[in-house]
Each structure stands twice: as structure tokens, then as C-alpha cells.
Interface confidence: medium
């Protein structure tokens, strides 16, 4: 499969475990992948009694679950780790939980930050 309509070159980056993993905490990530594979952005988080704990954001490699998704929407009902992916630069800035089995849609807005570019 070739690159999608919304070609992904950069994603919002975040790592809650940045100190232990010796990475930046947040910024922008340039996505790199194989020539014939699509690139995506993702966001992952936990929901502990209504409190959202962001886990990671960044680039995600070729995944049919992300194809042609312009918004980052997690659809699993009650997972251990919520996960969404999408196509298009910085599409993982906002992320949403909309379970396929029905239930309220919850959208998470990021706090304003000064991004750092990761290469």
C-alpha cells in the first residue's frame, strides 16, 4: 500500500516515562518508515477513575486500524491502555474515546506547550 491521502510526516511527541527512558518529555517527532508503508500518529493514555494519564504520543508504523482516520479516536470499551491513531501531521494533538459499543464521547484537549523538535 502506498502513502495515504493525508501523508504523515510529523506527530506530536510525548513520553510520560521520559526520565527513566532518557528521552525528551514532549515535542514534535519526524516520522520515518519504509518507502511502501504508511505512517501514522498515535496517542496512548490510561483513565484512572476519570483522571486521564497520558502515556505516550508519537509516530506509528503502517497499521490498517489507522488508515484514512483524520482524528485520533479510541474505540475499545474499557482497555488497560487507551490507544488511538490517525493520518495527517499532528493529528494526535487531540484524542477522543468513543466506544464502538456505545457510550459517551470524551475528547481530551492538550494543554498549550512550547514544542521541541525531535529527530
Amino acid at each position: 500500500s502506498g502513502r495515504g491521502e493525508a501523508e504523515t510526516r510529523e506527530c506530536i511527541y510525548y513520553n510520560a516515562n521520559w526520565e527513566l527512558e532518557r528521552t525528551n518529555q514532549s515535542g514534535l517527532e519526524r516520522c520515518e518508515g519504509e518507502q511502501d508503508k504508511r505512517l501514522h500518529c498515535y496517542a496512548s493514555w490510561r483513565n484512572s477513575s476519570g483522571t486521564i494519564e497520558l502515556v505516550k504520543k508519537g509516530c506509528w508504523l503502517d497499521d490498517f486500524n489507522c488508515y484514512d482516520r483524520q482524528e485520533c479516536v479510541a474505540t475499545e470499551e474499557n482497555p488497560q491502555v487507551y490507544f488511538c491513531c490517525c493520518e495527517g501531521n499532528f493529528c494526535n494533538e487531540r484524542f477522543t474515546h468513543l466506544p464502538e459499543a456505545g457510550g459517551p464521547e470524551v475528547t481530551y484537549e492538550p494543554p498549550p506547550t512550547a514544542p521541541t523538535l525531535l529527530t
Epitope: 508504523l61 503502517d62 497499521d63 490498517f64 486500524n65 474505540t75 470499551e77 482497555p79 491502555v81 464502538e100
Partner: antibody
Framework: EVQLLESGGGLVQPGGSLRLSCAAS????????MTWVRQAPGKGLEWVSV????????YYADSVKGRFTISRDNSKNTLYLQMNSLRAEDTAVYYC???????????WGQGTTVTVSS | DIQMTQSPSSVSASVGDRVTITCRAS??????LAWYQQKPGKAPKLLIY???SLQSGVPSRFSGSGSGTDFTLTISSLQPEDFATYYC?????????FGGGTKVEIK
């Protein structure tokens, strides 16, 4: 209780075909990607194929591409693996497994044995 | 494809020992790694997901760490039921490749 139960394994000659089934219960089957993993006798685990919850997306390992077809019937809560042009090296225990990709496979079946031999 | 290399391939240990298994990816996979335990004749069981998160119901003596290319599974105090083969698996890029396995045997 979340459960997966494989069936359809057996002895088949090289070049032959076999269809494996995996019956799921205890969870909303259509909401999850499903995977086949195999294990040759005395060897490690080998990822074979995955299908999206809707059935619209699939991936295959290079070793089975063009010979194996993964499919699902969400109305029957059943996952399938159609195996054609079987080779001796396809001899293995075949497991079906549930799980979102990022977490890994959190539920596995007990496995069904496929033997390809003349 | 991303290659996963596990070491050692086998380790002999006694009950109560601390056991460490390592897994190396051929390219960076962030923390998208799972660890499984498999006993003879049984299906694998998920122990750790996202490199360091303990799967529900798994004893706390199991822990995972690492990010990027280097990962570790640690059993802090080996119990009789822990003698098994352990596999890592990267879930960052299809195909979702496994490591070759590490057999933990009784010394």
C-alpha cells in the same frame, strides 16, 4: 469467561489444504483484532496473520503470504485460517489469540495441531 | 522486518534466585513490547505489555523495563511455577515478531 477454542487441525499431504476455526466467547468479538500464531515442534513462536475487528484489514507473515487467508464471521464469533499449498514447514501448533496490537495478545486458545506430511 | 534477539537462550536457576532476560530489537520500537510465559504443552500467557506494565493477575515478582531497542524481563524471586520459556514480542510494526525464547530451567 473469555475463551478461544481452535479446531480443524489434522494430518494433510504437502500441497493440500486445511481450514482452521477459532470460536470466541465471553467478549465483544467484533471489537477486537484477532491473530494467528504458530509454533513448530520444539521451536519458538511465529506470528502468522492478523485481521481487524471489522474484517476489513489483514496482514500476513511473508512465509504464508499468498497461501493463507485469514477471515472472520462476526455473526458467528468465529475466526478462520484457510491454508492452501501446505508445506512440511507449516507443521505446527496453531493458536488463535485476541488482543489489541499495543498490548499484545491477552487471550489465547489451547491450540490445534497441523501436520503436513506424505 | 524488525528482528528480536533474546538472551540467554536458556538459564539454570534455583528457587528464590533473581533472573534477568534481555531482548534487543533491530530498530527502535519505543516501549511497544510484550513478554509472554509458556509452559510445555500450553498456550503462551501475557505477562507484561508496553514494556513495563504488568498484565492483570500476574504476580508482582515479574517486572519489565526498557525502551527503544533494549528491554529486560526480571523475575525478582524465582518460584517453582516460573520454570518455563519466556518470549518477547514487538508490537510496533507488522509483522509482530517474537524473540527466540529463553528457557528458565531448574539448576
Amino acid at each position: 469467561e473469555v475463551q478461544l477454542l481452535e479446531s480443524g487441525g489434522g494430518l494433510v499431504q504437502p500441497g493440500g489444504s486445511l481450514r482452521l476455526s477459532c470460536a470466541a466467547s465471553g467478549f465483544t468479538f467484533g471489537s477486537y483484532g484477532m491473530t494467528w500464531v504458530r509454533q513448530a515442534p520444539g521451536k519458538g513462536l511465529e506470528w502468522v496473520s492478523v485481521i481487524s475487528g471489522s474484517g476489513g484489514g489483514t496482514y500476513y507473515a511473508d512465509s504464508v503470504k499468498g497461501r493463507f487467508t485469514i477471515s472472520r464471521d462476526n455473526s458467528k464469533n468465529t475466526l478462520y485460517l484457510q491454508m492452501n499449498s501446505l508445506r512440511a514447514e507449516d507443521t505446527a501448533v496453531y493458536y488463535c489469540a485476541k488482543g489489541p496490537r499495543i498490548v499484545g495478545m491477552d487471550v489465547w486458545g489451547q491450540g490445534t495441531t497441523v501436520t503436513v506430511s506424505s | 522486518d524488525i528482528q528480536m534477539t533474546q538472551s540467554p537462550s536458556s538459564v539454570s536457576a534455583s528457587v528464590g534466585d533473581r533472573v534477568t532476560i534481555t531482548c534487543r530489537a533491530s530498530q527502535g520500537i519505543s516501549s511497544w513490547l510484550a513478554w509472554y510465559q509458556q509452559k510445555p504443552g500450553k498456550a503462551p500467557k501475557l505477562l507484561i505489555y508496553a514494556a513495563s506494565s504488568l498484565q492483570s493477575g500476574v504476580p508482582s515478582r515479574f517486572s519489565g523495563s526498557g525502551s527503544g531497542t533494549d528491554f529486560t524481563l526480571t523475575i525478582s524471586s524465582l518460584q517453582p511455577e516460573d520454570f518455563a520459556t519466556y518470549y518477547c514480542q514487538q508490537v510496533f510494526s507488522y509483522p509482530l515478531t517474537f524473540g527466540g525464547g529463553t528457557k528458565v530451567e531448574i539448576k
